[in-house]
Interface confidence: low
């Protein structure tokens, strides 16, 4: 509450997060022309990345393009990309949607379609939909521990969200345990009125707001965090503005002295921890 | 504008960026003692890294040290590093400029020069200039989509920079399209009065400032972002303070059961998105 | 100092860090059943990661799990995890402490102990203590250069912590050189009243606070940074809340067409650079 007599100061904050959980992923794997069901286990080293404290990312879905090599190949025949003759293909042209630089030749993509040849990582990435349901949909049951250290330098006051009295096996609940700083990812979405299973397909950004309203006067001292959750990406976003949250990264390797890569388009939830508030003192 | 009667509140912000573009790189490649011209294509997975929302990095240049292995070898003969006898070399010494730990022996680096032997990743990195012009100079034509979600918690007000009416094929222009949030990298530099081609060689840091001056009173509501650009690194910086922007990273692999690495010194532009402003309400 | 007649404005900041130093690591290496002492050199590409400007990480210790492959194996026999019959093992169960999903079978871990079989990256990570002393304890002698560019947009004022007059071979000292922005990591810990050697074992978070108290009036202009240091993680934290600072990451590779990984549990110091302050002008 606003106490006009107080000297207010914004919070200086540092955050540390730790995600826990294992996902079992079942997907079709093609090897040597044979497709079979593959099971794999993803742990934290597989689905999360060492990011800054105030943000963490959990991969919930992916599309892989394996064994790419730098060469010439037909580009992917997405809408409007097919050709019937070389006239349609412009040497040196880089279509922002494409994944390579055109050579100027129109070549067969498969038995029925022709596309412009490109210099690229080949075969080029297929523009297929993200798998539905999401491959790591069980990430809903992962938990994240959030440690937040705050400082009001002008008041020379420091505290943190985890107190010695807290129980390390607790789970945050708005009513029953509002001070517990271990959060189940599915609960965060539920609190924000969002459907984890749905968002996991394309990815998204979820805000975890930590609000510190601190009264630092000795006679009415109060300084504990309040947690709230809201979705930060626009779920109604137009296709052209890249809805959801994804990024591409590559694993490079050599085979028979040829540099190759596996391209992974990773969809997932980026959690942004937004710490704000003020410390007031007479 | 300052309305003294209003209750002002700082902005809470979350940013998501998406870079698009392909670069064709031509460089001399030496294999088996033969040097020839090599062409390669770089896409987003090759030149950018999954960083936090409020920063993104675009590699514009690089120097590679391939096939390094942990062993003993002569250090690079940079200015002041040559020796004529073992007396010049101190066992256990780590020169901050060097890349290894001296063994105490002075050994031939090539036919004409001797340097102190070091325990290091060998052969040690050559201290050569960054290629000029920059290898990925065409990154000037890459574009970045910036999505910014803001919140004034005290006023319980949320908005974003991308409106449903926006056109996904727009490009930001200060005069013609100041609300478009797709930016051509070259334009950002031009707006900041900087030369992309020049900065791309050594790298640099570019600030994209998003200023929200929001009047949240219903009778004169206004809340849209203003974009401005300024260079954040010091272009006149003394050599000793590491001008430009670069970092080293490694790709590790095994060959004949020996761990090896390719060391990449990546030069590039780090773009920092600095969101600030206030929301005022009577 | 508070000048009530001044219009105060918070600082907008951008940070760039550069770590320098080499560590020699000696550890027991087992190959083909034979254990011998291995020496290796770690340079910046090995112990640090390209993070955002306002944070950097220096690995000071690690535990490796080499040659893991996705299969079935007994889980690690940590306290409470042993079994004597299949009844103790629940098919499909994921213990948050475990690294896999139980198959329902109780199998021998070694000659004396049995544990539940799991589907996981195998062999599962041994839950052993972080090496003591820390493997990269010599990181105490690494240095970090911190470049900080600040801006008060309302006052249209920009400056930075590195001035042209500064000496690039200086080292920060609270009394003798308080404006030098090259910091020895060990000195940062000493200033904060912490023991680097101790913290390096389990890792931790260290805050480097840069306080700008700027008087921008022309007649009494002053705008230089003040550096201070404080530990941000809780050294007295209960085991259940994950004391110290570590994260796991993996290096993936293929061997005989089987995907394998080396899992690294990296302990280290995350340095958070917290920039704050105000610019005041009449």
């Amino acid at each position: 509450s606003d106490k006009l007599y107080q000297r207010k100061e914004p919070v200086i904050s540092s955050v540390h997060t730790k995600v826990k959980g294992i996902a079992e992923v079942t997907e079709n794997v093609t090897e040597g022309g044979v497709t079979k069901l593959g099971h794999s286990i993803f742990d934290t080293a597989d689905y999360t990345f060492p990011l800054q404290g105030n943000s963490f990312f959990v991969m919930t879905n992916y599309v892989k393009s394996e064994g790419q090599v730098q060469t010439l190949c037909p580009e992917y025949p997405r809408r409007g990309a097919q050709c019937s003759s070389d006239r349609r293909c412009k040497k040196g042209w880089m279509d922002p949607q494409s994944k390579g630089i055109q050579t100027g030749r129109c070549v067969p993509y498969d038995k029925t379609r022709k596309t412009c040849e490109v210099s690229a990582w080949c075969p080029t990435e297929e523009e297929k939909e993200a798998p539905r349901p999401a491959l790591l949909r069980s990430a809903e049951n992962f938990t994240v521990l959030i440690k937040n250290n705050i400082h009001f330098p002008g008041h020379n006051y420091t505290t943190r969200n985890i107190l010695p009295t807290m129980n390390g096996s607790c789970t945050f609940h708005k009513t029953w345990d509002p001070q517990c700083s271990i959060f189940r990812l599915g609960d965060i979405f539920q609190e924000a009125g969002e459907n984890f299973t749905e968002v996991a397909v394309q990815g998204g950004i979820m805000g975890i707001e930590i609000y510190w309203d601190c009264n630092l006067d000795s006679w009415s001292h109060h300084c504990r965090p309040r947690y709230s959750f809201r979705r930060l990406d626009d779920k109604n976003m137009d296709e052209s503005f890249v809805p959801g949250y994804n990024f591409r990264y590559a694993k490079y390797y050599k085979e028979n002295n040829v540099e190759k890569r596996t391209l992974i388009k990773a969809f997932g939830i980026r959690f942004d921890i937004l710490v704000f508030g003020t410390g007031g003192k007479f | 504008s300052d309305k003294l009667y209003q209750r002002k509140e700082p902005v809470i912000s979350s940013v998501h960026t998406k870079v698009k573009g392909i670069a064709e790189v031509t460089e001399n490649v030496t294999e088996g003692g033969v040097t020839k011209l090599g062409h390669s294509i770089f896409d987003t997975a090759d030149y950018t890294f999954p960083l936090q929302g409020n920063s993104f990095f675009v590699m514009t240049n690089y120097v590679k040290s391939e096939g390094q292995v942990q062993t003993l070898c002569p250090e690079y003969p940079r200015r002041g590093a040559q020796c004529s006898s073992d007396r010049r070399c101190k066992k256990g010494w780590m020169d901050p400029q060097s890349k290894g730990i001296q063994t105490g022996r002075c050994v031939p680096y090539d036919k004409t020069r001797k340097t102190c032997e070091v325990s290091a990743w060998c052969p040690t990195e050559e201290e050569k200039e960054a290629p000029r012009p920059a290898l990925l100079r065409s990154a000037e034509n890459f574009t970045v989509l910036i999505k910014n979600n803001i919140h004034f918690p005290g006023h319980n007000y949320t908005t974003r920079n991308i409106l449903p009416t926006m056109n996904g094929s727009c490009t930001f222009h200060k005069t013609w399209d100041p609300q478009c949030s797709i930016f051509r990298l070259g334009d950002i530099f031009q707006e900041a009065g900087e030369n992309f081609t020049e900065v791309a060689v050594q790298g640099g840091i570019m600030g994209i400032e998003i200023y929200w001056d929001c009047n949240l009173d219903s009778w004169s509501h206004h809340c849209r972002p203003r974009y401005s650009f300024r260079r954040l690194d010091d272009k006149n910086m003394d050599e000793s303070f590491v001008p430009g922007y670069n970092f080293r990273y490694a790709k590790y692999y095994k060959e004949n059961n020996v761990e090896k690495r390719t060391l990449i010194k990546a030069f590039g532009i780090r773009f920092d998105i600095l969101v600030f402003g206030t929301g005022g309400k009577f | 100092s508070d000048k009530l007649y001044q219009r105060k404005e918070p600082v907008i900041s951008s940070v760039h860090t550069k770590v320098k130093g080499i560590a020699e690591v000696t550890e027991n290496v087992t190959e083909g059943g034979v254990t011998k002492l291995g020496h290796s050199i770690f340079d910046t590409a090995d112990y640090t990661f390209p993070l955002q400007g306002n944070s950097f990480f220096v690995m000071t210790n690690y535990v490796k799990s080499e040659g893991q492959v996705q299969t079935l194996c007994p889980e690690y026999p940590r306290r409470g995890a042993q079994c004597s019959s299949d009844r103790r093992c629940k098919k499909g169960w994921m213990d948050p402490q475990s690294k896999g999903i139980q198959t329902g079978r109780c199998v021998p871990y070694d000659k004396t102990r049995k544990t539940c079989e799991v589907s996981a990256w195998c062999p599962t990570e041994e839950e052993k203590e972080a090496p003591r002393p820390a493997l990269l304890r010599s990181a105490e002698n690494f240095t970090v250069l911190i470049k900080n560019n600040i801006h008060f947009p309302g006052h249209n004022y920009t400056t930075r912590n590195i001035l042209p007059t500064m000496n690039g071979s200086c080292t920060f000292h609270k009394t003798w050189d308080p404006q030098c922005s090259i910091f020895r990591l060990g000195d940062i810990f000493q200033e904060a009243g912490e023991n680097f050697t101790e913290v390096a074992v389990q890792g931790g978070i260290m805050g480097i606070e840069i306080y700008w108290d700027c008087n921008l009036d022309s007649w009494s202009h002053h705008c230089r940074p003040r550096y201070s240091f404080r530990r941000l993680d809780d050294k007295n934290m209960d085991e259940s809340f994950v004391p110290g600072y570590n994260f796991r990451y993996a290096k993936y590779y293929k061997e005989n067409n089987v995907e394998k990984r080396t899992l690294i549990k990296a302990f280290g110091i995350r340095f958070d650079i917290l920039v704050f302050g105000t610019g005041g002008k009449f």
């Epitope: - | - | 409470g80 079994c83 004597s84 009844r87 103790r88």
Partner: nanobody, 123 residues
Framework: EVQLVESGGGLVQAGGSLRVSCAAS???????MGWFRQAPGKEREFVST????????VYADSVKGRFTISRDNAKDTVYLQMNSLKPEDTAVYYC?????????????????WGQGTQVTVSS
């Protein structure tokens, strides 16, 4: 199904001693065994545990140096010798068995529980 039966509880003066026993209805030689206690109005808490072969023992800080746990696998019985008893040791003492051979202080690691025996320490 293993049944555990505690005995030996009772009333004792502060500073006195007591030995409680726990007999199993089936072979428990490969089990780890433990003692827990619950004072009126409080949660059940760990007291002590012993591994299958008696090599590993663990004690709660509050009883260290005063209580001793032991076992006789031939008789499938576990004992808790309590010396220098204090009024705060007053509680119902439960014997617990775990099919794991390893020692554990966690209640949920124990599959089998006795009905409990009352120990009262008067001042």
């Amino acid at each position: 199904e293993v049944q555990l039966v505690e005995s030996g509880g009772g009333l004792v003066q502060a500073g006195g001693s007591l030995r409680v026993s726990c007999a199993a209805s089936a072979r428990t030689g490969s089990y780890s065994m433990g003692w827990f206690r619950q004072a009126p109005g409080k949660e059940r808490e760990f007291v002590s545990t012993i591994s299958w072969n008696g090599a590993d023992t663990v004690y709660a800080d509050s009883v260290k140096g005063r209580f001793t746990i032991s076992r006789d696998n031939a008789k499938d019985t576990v004992y808790l010798q309590m010396n220098s008893l204090k009024p705060e040791d007053t509680a119902v003492y439960y014997c617990a068995g775990s099919i794991t051979s390893y020692v554990s202080t966690w209640q949920h690691d124990y599959e089998y529980w006795g009905q409990g025996t009352q120990v009262t320490v008067s001042s």
